[in-house]
Every structure is written in structure tokens, then in C-alpha cells.
């Protein structure tokens, strides 16, 4: 259950994370399962353990095998297994299936290809990207942070993409490569000026003082994956985070839904323990994309207690 496959190429760096997690303060011990031999923590070793990480700097084919990590929590010793396979470098250009990370799909509007496992390494930009062993050149390709963006994606852009970067450990540099397939969805999408489905313009929302209230800002932006689209709430023309009222929070992350094939986003504004002063604020639901911005304003009113009987 707590087992994970990891792979790499000989003479490259490989860093593996223990499949069991834990607090940073927890001790993690690593063992080579076949011999039950402890993995050293001293960085002078080619293979060494560093907390939840097992580092092969660089990896060798003989390192292949199952490694056991034991996370020592205050109650239990929690065990995980890392199944590591190190392969010889191929002389030809083809990347075999067993070296491939998960396939990603893209479309004309969304063509990000993330470099797999890069978050485990100490690397600095820029990344180098290759497609079918050829270095990517031209203005259509942009290496941005840990991903590649392809402008105006076409079906011919499908293929195997390899990212290459340098891992630095105590001043020593090690090369790392990772490859994944990219497929192009034939998506006849379009984008239009945002349409806010809720709330209605100048809506009055009834709330009860002392209770919690939720306002949902929901807007659609076109069909298919949208490259730039967002919905958010403002209070009296100020971003929620800048307004400084901890009782009033936007729900983390925007929910994406596809209504009748349309790409729509929701953002929920949660008001805890509604106060009288909340009724004086102006609540703006904003929807924006490349075409522009649309705003719907909501105000709160006190729910008449008599309503409960009607």
C-alpha cells in the first residue's frame, strides 16, 4: 500500500521521497531492503538519506532495488517502500515506455507541460526542453519555472517531451532528465466576454445576524479550456485579502465546471457570524478574462424573523 515506483538513468541524479509522510521533526531511517543495511546520512556518500528523501548522486544501475523508509512518529514507526530502478542510458533517441512519466494533454488554449519530479531537486532556471531528442527552439516555446508553454498548439506538437535540468548538492552539479508524452486534444473551443450567472446584478441577499452566509460568484467564459479566466470577490472595491476582515474569506481555489459544454468558474465568499456592519458593505462579484471584466454588485439585508413563519 505504501509503496512507490521510482526510476532514473545511470550517472544522473535521482531523488526519491518516502511514500510515508510525517512532520518535519520526525526522524526517517532508510534501509536497503535486500540486505537490511542502513543507508548513511553523511553527504560524502554517493547514496545517502536526508530526512524523507533518498539521494543517488549520481545513480548507478547496481542501486536498483527496494528501499525501506521508516518514519518514527511519537506513536508508531510507519513504514514505506521505494522500488527504485536505474536504467542504462540509451544510445539511440527513443525513450522506452518504462522511463516515461504520466501523459499530459493539452489544447490550443492550454498547453502546459510540467517537468516531472522536479520539485524534489535543488535546481535553478532555466530548464532545457527537448522533443523527440531535438532541443526546442523558436518563439512558440517558453520555458517558464517548472513547465513548458507551447503557443498556438497544433496536432503536430504531440510527442515525447524531455526536460533537463541541473541538481546542485553542496556545490556539485548533477544532470537530471525526465520524459513524458504530450497529446493534443482536438478541441474547437472559444472564449467570450464573461457572463455572470450568479449573483444577479444589484441582488439583495437576505442574511441572519450571527449566522454564517455564503455568496457564490459564478461565471462562464466560453467553451473548452480557457487560458486566462478568473472570478473573485471584492469588498467596497478592495480585494478580500486586503480588506482585513478574517470573518470574510474567499473559498480557496476556484471550482471549474462545464455547464452545457461551457467553461465556468465559481468562487464562494464565506461570511462567518454575520454582523450589522456587514450590511453596509458592497459585495462585488468580478469575472474577467482576455476579453475584459464584468462586475455584479450584491448587498446584504437583514432577514426579517417573521419570514420563518411564512
Amino acid at each position: 500500500k505504501f509503496s512507490k515506483q521510482s526510476w532514473g538513468l545511470e550517472n544522473e541524479a535521482l531523488i526519491v521521497r518516502c511514500p510515508r509522510q510525517g512532520k518535519p521533526s520526525y526522524t526517517v531511517d532508510w534501509y536497503y531492503s535486500q540486505t537490511n543495511k542502513s543507508i548513511p546520512t553523511q553527504e560524502r556518500n554517493r547514496v545517502f538519506a536526508s530526512g524523507q528523501l533518498l539521494k543517488f548522486l549520481p545513480a548507478a544501475v547496481a542501486d536498483s532495488g527496494i528501499y525501506t523508509c521508516i518514519v518514527r512518529s511519537p506513536t508508531f514507526n510507519r513504514t514505506g517502500y521505494a522500488n527504485v530502478t536505474i536504467y542504462k542510458k540509451q544510445s539511440d533517441c527513443n525513450v522506452p515506455d518504462y522511463l516515461m512519466y504520466s501523459t499530459v494533454s493539452g489544447s490550443e488554449k492550454n498547453s502546459k507541460i510540467y517537468c516531472p519530479t522536479i520539485d524534489l531537486y535543488n535546481w535553478t532556471a532555466p530548464l532545457e526542453w527537448f522533443k523527440n531528442c531535438q532541443a526546442l527552439q523558436g518563439s512558440r516555446y517558453r520555458a517558464h519555472k517548472s513547465f513548458l508553454v507551447i503557443d498556438n498548439v497544433m496536432t503536430e506538437d504531440a510527442g515525447d517531451y524531455t526536460c533537463k535540468f541541473i541538481h546542485n548538492e553542496n556545490g556539485a552539479n548533477y544532470s537530471v532528465t525526465a520524459t513524458r508524452s504530450f497529446t493534443v486534444k482536438d478541441e474547437q473551443g472559444f472564449s467570450l466576454f464573461p457572463v455572470i450567472g450568479a449573483p444577479a446584478q444589484n441582488e439583495i441577499k437576505e442574511v441572519e445576524i450571527g449566522k454564517n452566509a455564503n455568496l457564490t460568484c459564478s461565471a462562464c467564459f466560453g467553451k473548452g479550456t480557457q487560458f486566462l479566466a478568473a472570478v473573485l470577490w471584492q469588498l467596497n472595491g478592495t480585494k478580500i485579502t486586503d480588506f482585513g476582515e478574517p470573518r470574510i474569506q474567499q473559498e480557496e481555489g476556484q471550482n471549474q465546471s462545464f455547464s452545457n459544454g461551457l467553461a465556468c468558474l465559481d468562487m464562494v465568499l464565506r461570511i462567518a457570524d454575520v454582523k450589522e456592519e456587514d450590511l453596509l458593505l458592497q459585495y462585488d462579484c468580478l469575472a474577467l478574462n482576455l476579453h475584459g471584466l464584468r462586475r455584479h454588485t450584491v448587498r446584504l439585508s437583514r432577514k426579517n424573523p417573521i419570514d420563518h413563519h411564512s
Epitope: K1, R20, Q21, G22, K23, S25, V71, S73, P74, T75, F76, R78
Partner: antibody, heavy 121, light 106 residues
Framework: QVQLVQSGAEVKKPGASVKVSCKAS????????LHWVRQAPGQGLEWMGT????????VYNQKFKARVTMTADKSTSTAYMELSSLRSEDTAVYYC??????????????WGQGTLVTVSS | EIVLTQSPATLSLSPGERATLSCSVS?????MHWYQQKPGQAPRLLIY???KLASGIPARFSGSGSGTDFTLTISSLEPEDFAVYYC?????????FGGGTKVEIK
């Protein structure tokens, strides 16, 4: 949703044993350690120990080590806590409880409703 | 074992007031968890890892501290906040709880 449902109240005589059950639902039983906490009338909370249902491994509070046995039945997703050699000071509400996410030990997010065990001659 | 001492034992306040509850630890711990308990109910997790708000808990609750001194703050007491509050450490076995602070209506 996660639910921990405990067995009903028990009345026991001093020297006897009691076995409290805790039936889990709404999640994979073997993925989470289950803990037992007790609370004597008008008193605070006291951790008794924990079991890993996957392996059956247990860690007990030294105070109870000689008298407590925690077990788990994977087939019914039920954990049990048996306390022997009961005395009057064992009169308490016994809770089973679980963390929100196992590996990070972020406090007890889910609790059973509690089982009152009364020890009286 | 690690001993947690809560103070005050009882806190008498009015709705709308600020409540500050303390938890002192016999030896340094990395994190503290806080629970609320009402009569006849199981405890409810309020704050985990010293300062993180548990799911569904209002933002008026906050936690802080490090090492041997931790604090739970209720910025403005609501009627439903009058209850007993416990701190708990998960730094070493046995896991231990504080003796509790009762927040009562003045």
C-alpha cells in the same frame, strides 16, 4: 462521511473486564490508526493508547499497559478496547478517535459518541 | 511524560469579550492542538499544529506559541463558545492533554 460508532453503556463490578467496540465507516479502516481516550466524570481527557488496524500493532500508555488490550477486526472495520481488573476509578466515558490525516498527527479530528463504563459493587 | 498545565482553570467573561487561554508545557514540543468540549459531547478539534484552524471552525478562534508556551485566543466570544477547552501534545508518547480551562459566562 467519517463515522465512529461505539457500543452502549456498561455497568461492571470491580475486578471484572469490559470490552468497548468502535465501528468505523466512511473511510478505509486500515489506513488510519485508531486511538482511545477516556474521561472520568468532571475530569480531563486521558490518552490510553492506539492501534494500527492494518498490522494490529499497538502502543499503550504505560499507566494502562498491564490492563488494556486493543484489537481490530478488519473484516468488520471495528476496533475494540478491553480493560481488565476494573476498579471504581475506571468509571469514565471511553472515546475512540482518529486523526484527520494519518501521517501528520494533526490532532483528533473524528470522535466516537463515547461509551460510559460504570464500575460499581 | 510531558505535562501540560492550563491556566486559568476558569475564565469568567461576557459575550463579545476576548478570551486568552494558556497552556504551559513541562518540556519543549513542536506543535500544540486545541479542543472544545461541551457537556455531554465528545471533544471537537479547534486548532491543530499550533495555529491551523480545523475544518468548519470560525475564524474568531486562533492559536499561537512555541516551545513551552502556547495560547488559544477567541477574539470575540459568542454564546456558543462557553465550554471547556483542552490543549494536547503529540510530540512524544504518551500523548497528553492539559487539565482544561472552563470558559463561563460572567
Amino acid at each position: 462521511q467519517v463515522q465512529l460508532v461505539q457500543s452502549g453503556a456498561e455497568v461492571k463490578k470491580p475486578g471484572a473486564s469490559v470490552k468497548v467496540s468502535c465501528k468505523a465507516s466512511g473511510y478505509t479502516f486500515t489506513d488510519y490508526e485508531l486511538h482511545w481516550v477516556r474521561q472520568a466524570p468532571g475530569q480531563g481527557l486521558e490518552w490510553m493508547g492506539t492501534i494500527d488496524p492494518e498490522t494490529g500493532d499497538t502502543v499503550y500508555n504505560q499507566k494502562f499497559k498491564a490492563r488494556v488490550t486493543m484489537t481490530a477486526d478488519k473484516s468488520t472495520s471495528t476496533a475494540y478496547m478491553e480493560l481488565s481488573s476494573l476498579r471504581s476509578e475506571d468509571t469514565a466515558v471511553y472515546y475512540c478517535t482518529r486523526a484527520f490525516y494519518n501521517d501528520y498527527d494533526e490532532g483528533f479530528a473524528y470522535w466516537g459518541q463515547g461509551t460510559l463504563v460504570t464500575v460499581s459493587s | 511524560e510531558i505535562v501540560l498545565t492550563q491556566s486559568p482553570a476558569t475564565l469568567s467573561l461576557s459575550p463579545g469579550e476576548r478570551a486568552t487561554l494558556s497552556c504551559s508545557v513541562s518540556s519543549s514540543v513542536s506543535y500544540m492542538h486545541w479542543y472544545q468540549q461541551k457537556p455531554g459531547q465528545a471533544p471537537r478539534l479547534l486548532i491543530y499544529d499550533t495555529s491551523k484552524l480545523a475544518s468548519g471552525i470560525p475564524a474568531r478562534f486562533s492559536g499561537s506559541g512555541s516551545g513551552t508556551d502556547f495560547t488559544l485566543t477567541i477574539s470575540s466570544l459568542e454564546p456558543e463558545d462557553f465550554a471547556v477547552y483542552y490543549c494536547q501534545q503529540w510530540n512524544s508518547s504518551p500523548l497528553t492533554f492539559g487539565g482544561g480551562t472552563k470558559v463561563e459566562i460572567k
